[in-house]
């Protein structure tokens, strides 16, 4: 007499790519169209996911793994394996729930997403400002001031000469 | 469309033996499991267990003690069930049932018997 | 094995709302299925894997939740739904059913 309770779960006999189910003729059975499952003896093949809107495929759904998506152009990926799609800003640019709209005096963002950034404060390091930052970009510290005092050299002193016809070992 | 037909009601004394029958129809027979489900008077269903109607292996529920058997007429595209020594507690109707898996939701009795009253009196 | 309990009556009016419950004593998942049975009928499928609405049947019929506790729900009850409403799991073996529960409409 079979019973129902067997020592061995027929399904881990099962593997990635199907599902399994005691209670049918064949235990183990494909995942049918657009399902899939990643590992074996799973009890249920999973919904691949679709990739529509401003969600493009980046992998097709196989049997064994879900589809991958990334956004269309002009949109970037957000949260994990790319759940959000974000509309892209141009640098110098946040995102507002009003849209994109230029970074504040004294910010930055130097990217198409994100938010807008301090400038770097050069004297927090007992640096000067040596480029001034825009909206786009952060502002370049340079040396102390005390390392530009007369008598304190700035100037990197110069590579020795190589001889002709030698080249860098 | 998706028809199981069962045999009609059965009189019986405690000790005979009684065998019912399942016709199906409107699906390849041999493609579902068929299962077996008792419900006493005034009572709740109960799954007595199944037969794969490919290979013809029943499973049985640990508490049928033997008396109960599950077999096929595959070209006739019926499942059969058989009590012997039949006692007054198997006074029930007892359905046969298609199971149904789709692969992404669990399985389910998609469709059903009509039921066969099993009456055992002396 | 896994019991499934249910309360055993319930009685509402035409076009009230009516919730029938099924407990699991292990989880089983989604995978829970709701019956109706009228006297003297076969059980027809009305829910599968917890919330899925069967072909044919009204969407007056709704399932849900998850693991050990579920709800079947008639919104709004009509005359014609006097039956006893059973759940069923088919996650654990051996399969279980629950007692059952008698829908009068008053």
């Known amino acids: 007499f079979e019973r129902t309770r067997s020592l061995q779960d027929p399904c881990s006999n099962c593997p990635a790519g199907t599902f399994c189910d005691n209670n049918r003729n064949q235990i183990c059975s494909p995942c049918p169209p657009n399902s899939f499952s990643s590992a074996g003896g799973q009890r249920t093949c999973d919904i691949c996911r679709q990739c529509k809107g401003v969600f493009r495929t980046r992998k097709e759904c196989s049997s064994t793994s879900n589809a991958e998506c990334d956004c269309t152009p002009g949109f970037h990926c957000l949260g994990a394996g790319c759940s959000m799609c974000e509309q892209d800003c141009k640098q110098g640019q946040e995102l507002t729930k009003k849209g994109c709209k230029d970074c504040c005096f004294g910010t930055f963002n130097d990217q198409k997403r994100g938010i807008c950034r301090p400038w770097t404060n050069c004297s927090l390091d007992g640096k000067s400002v040596l480029v001034n930052g825009t909206k786009e970009r952060d502002v370049v510290c340079g040396p102390s001031p005390a390392d530009l005092s007369p008598g304190a050299s700035s100037v990197t002193p110069p590579a020795p000469a190589r001889e002709p016809g030698h080249s860098p070992q | 469309q998706i028809q199981l037909v069962q045999s009609g009601p059965e009189l019986k004394k405690p000790g005979e033996s009684v065998k019912i029958s399942c016709k199906a129809s409107?699906?390849?027979?041999?493609?579902?499991?068929m299962h077996w489900v008792k419900q006493a008077p005034g009572k709740a269903l109960k799954w007595m267990g199944l037969?794969?109607?490919?290979?013809?292996?029943?499973t049985y529920v640990d508490d049928l003690k033997g008396r109960f058997v599950f077999s096929l007429e595959a070209s006739a595209s019926t499942a059969k069930l058989q009590i012997s020594n039949l006692k007054n507690e198997d006074t029930a109707i007892y359905f046969c049932?298609?199971?149904?898996?789709?692969?992404?939701?669990?399985?389910?009795?998609?469709?059903w018997g009509q039921g066969t009253l099993v009456t055992v009196s002396s | 094995d896994t019991v499934l309990t249910q309360s055993p009556a319930l009685a509402v009016s035409p076009g009230e709302r009516v919730t029938v419950s099924c407990g699991a004593t292990?989880?089983?998942?989604?995978?829970l299925n709701w019956y109706q049975q009228k006297p003297g009928q076969q059980p027809r499928l009305l829910i599968y894997?917890?919330?899925n609405l069967e072909s044919g049947v009204p969407a007056r019929f709704s399932g849900s939740g998850s693991g050990t506790d579920f709800t079947l729900s008639i919104d709004p009850v009509e005359a014609d739904d006097t039956a006893t409403y059973f759940c069923?799991?088919?996650?654990?073996?051996?399969?279980?059913f629950g007692s059952g529960t008698k829908l009068e409409i008053k």
């Open positions: 037969i794969n109607t490919y290979t013809g292996k029943p």
């Open positions: 049932a298609r199971y149904y898996h789709d692969g992404t939701y669990y399985g389910w009795f998609a469709n």
């Open positions: 069923q799991q088919t996650w654990n073996d051996p399969l279980t």
């Open positions: 292990e989880s089983v998942s989604t995978a």
């Open positions: 409107g699906y390849t027979f041999t493609d579902y499991a």
């Open positions: 894997g917890a919330s």
